[in-house]
């Protein structure tokens, strides 16, 4: 089995997590991709996913999560904006490849969000930017449900998660339209 490694990101409330997940573009360019949270003792839960097939560079926003899949570059960009302490946890990028198990990209992300004034609001990077606007996308994200012979079959989600503008106050911990997706490496 592949050794799962973690990359720690320590950010303050209000900042933005900005993760670049690389993939082999010839293989996975149009595959559907997802951002998942992994809670202790639970299967990974999908918080947001790209469309199927994934659209090149087209942003998909679910609450405070923005996914951008750059087919030309083999890169999935994941941003979680306006971070809250309760967003702390373990996350991962995956590629859906039915009927096989989802394929994990990149290292898992150990996000630690602490209280305190953020000197660079809207970003976890150095203040090298002069423009940072979050587009008000209105895409609906329908994430598939996959099961594995090694996991319990689960019921499909009640509905799709509506996309909201950056002004929306949606806590990731309160998102109900999430899907459990098993990931094995």
């Amino acid at each position: 089995a592949t050794k799962l490694t973690e990359e720690k990101y320590e950010l303050k409330e209000g900042q933005t997590l900005d993760v670049k997940c690389d993939y082999t573009l010839e293989k996975f360019a149009s595959s559907q991709k997802a951002w998942q949270i992994i809670r202790d003792g639970e299967m990974p839960k999908t918080l947001a996913c790209t469309e199927r097939p994934s659209k090149n560079s087209h942003p998909v926003q679910v609450g405070r999560i923005i996914l951008e899949d750059y087919h030309d570059h083999g890169l999935l960009r994941v941003r979680m904006v306006n971070l809250q302490v309760e967003d702390s946890g373990l996350y991962q990028c995956v590629i859906y490849q039915p009927p096989k198990e989802p394929h994990m990209l990149f290292d898992r992300i150990r996000l630690v969000v602490t209280k305190g004034f953020s000197g660079t609001p809207g970003s976890n990077e150095n203040s090298t930017q002069n423009v940072y606007k979050i587009p008000p996308t209105t895409t609906k994200a329908l994430c598939p449900l996959y099961t594995s012979p090694r996991t319990v079959t689960q019921a499909p989600p009640k509905s799709t998660a509506d996309v909201s503008t950056p002004d929306s106050e949606i806590n990731l911990t309160n998102v109900t339209d999430i899907i459990r997706v098993p990931v094995f490496n």
Epitope: K20, S57, D72, N126, Q129
Partner: antibody, heavy 116, light 107 residues
Framework: EVQLVESGGGLVQPGGSLRLSCAAS????????MSWVRQAPGKGLDWVAS????????YYVDAVKGRFTISRDNAKNSLHLQMNSLRAEDTAVYYC?????????WGQGTLVTVSS | EIVMTQSPATLSVSPGERATLSCRAS??????LAWYQQKPGQAPRLLIY???IRATGIPARFSGSGSGTEFTLTISSLQSEDFAVYYC?????????FGGGTKVEIK
């Protein structure tokens, strides 16, 4: 085939200005981040600036912040770099590149020489 | 700013031999690392991204490995066209930064 053709380089005095342009073809320009990377004579590579497809995000290296402005015209498939208050240390070949983080395609570059 | 350090500065290798180039980051860049090749008078060319994924059209003799702060580019059997300068670059954080380069020359 991806093509990136830079223009606008030349000799300029310290404190002067230049506007570099890049004509892009062979790919969907409006779907791609674009950047400028420079290379001083006999030296290594230095990232200068990056711009998102819709210009909603723009980033600069500290050394050029406040002096250089990256912009794009998606209707004309063109990328620009307005360089003001030029210094001797800005002397370099400037490459137009496709990508905002890592760089898949490069132009052949245009030489900017800042000297009195 | 993440500082990228490449070693050695110059590597003398005979054609057909293996070349191993190193790149170290001053802090973790996860797998957000790319390698480029530049020949005299030419623009750089992307070889590897995501630390280990070969870019389109890159021969299998080029391979990348590593994660976090330590990375390696290996050229399994050097061909005449491989003698060039190689740069690593991190793209985890702004500002994007390159290593100083390793020149691979004929021994």
């Amino acid at each position: 085939e991806v093509q990136l053709v830079e223009s606008g380089g030349g000799l300029v005095q310290p404190g002067g200005s230049l506007r570099l342009s890049c004509a892009a073809s062979g790919f969907t320009f409006s779907s791609n981040w674009m950047s400028w990377v420079r290379q001083a004579p006999g030296k290594g590579l230095d990232w200068v600036a990056s711009i998102k497809q819709d210009a909603s995000e723009i980033y600069y290296v500290d050394a050029v912040k406040g002096r250089f402005t990256i912009s794009r015209d998606n209707a004309k498939n063109s990328l620009h770099l307005q360089m003001n208050s030029l210094r001797a240390e800005d002397t370099a070949v400037y490459y137009c590149v496709r990508g905002g983080w890592r760089f898949e395609s490069w132009g052949q570059g245009t030489l900017v020489t800042v000297s009195s | 700013e993440i500082v990228m350090t490449q070693s050695p500065a110059t590597l003398s290798v005979s054609p057909g031999e293996r070349a191993t180039l190193s790149c170290r980051a001053s802090q973790s860049v996860s797998s957000n690392l790319a390698w480029y090749q530049q020949k005299p008078g030419q623009a750089p060319r992307l070889l590897i991204y995501g630390a280990s994924i070969r870019a389109t059209g890159i021969p299998a003799r080029f391979s990348g490995s590593g994660s976090g702060t330590e990375f390696t580019l290996t050229i399994s059997s050097l061909q005449s066209e491989d003698f060039a300068v190689y740069y690593c670059q991190q793209y985890k954080n702004w500002p994007l930064t390159f290593g100083g380069g390793t020149k691979v020359e004929i021994k």
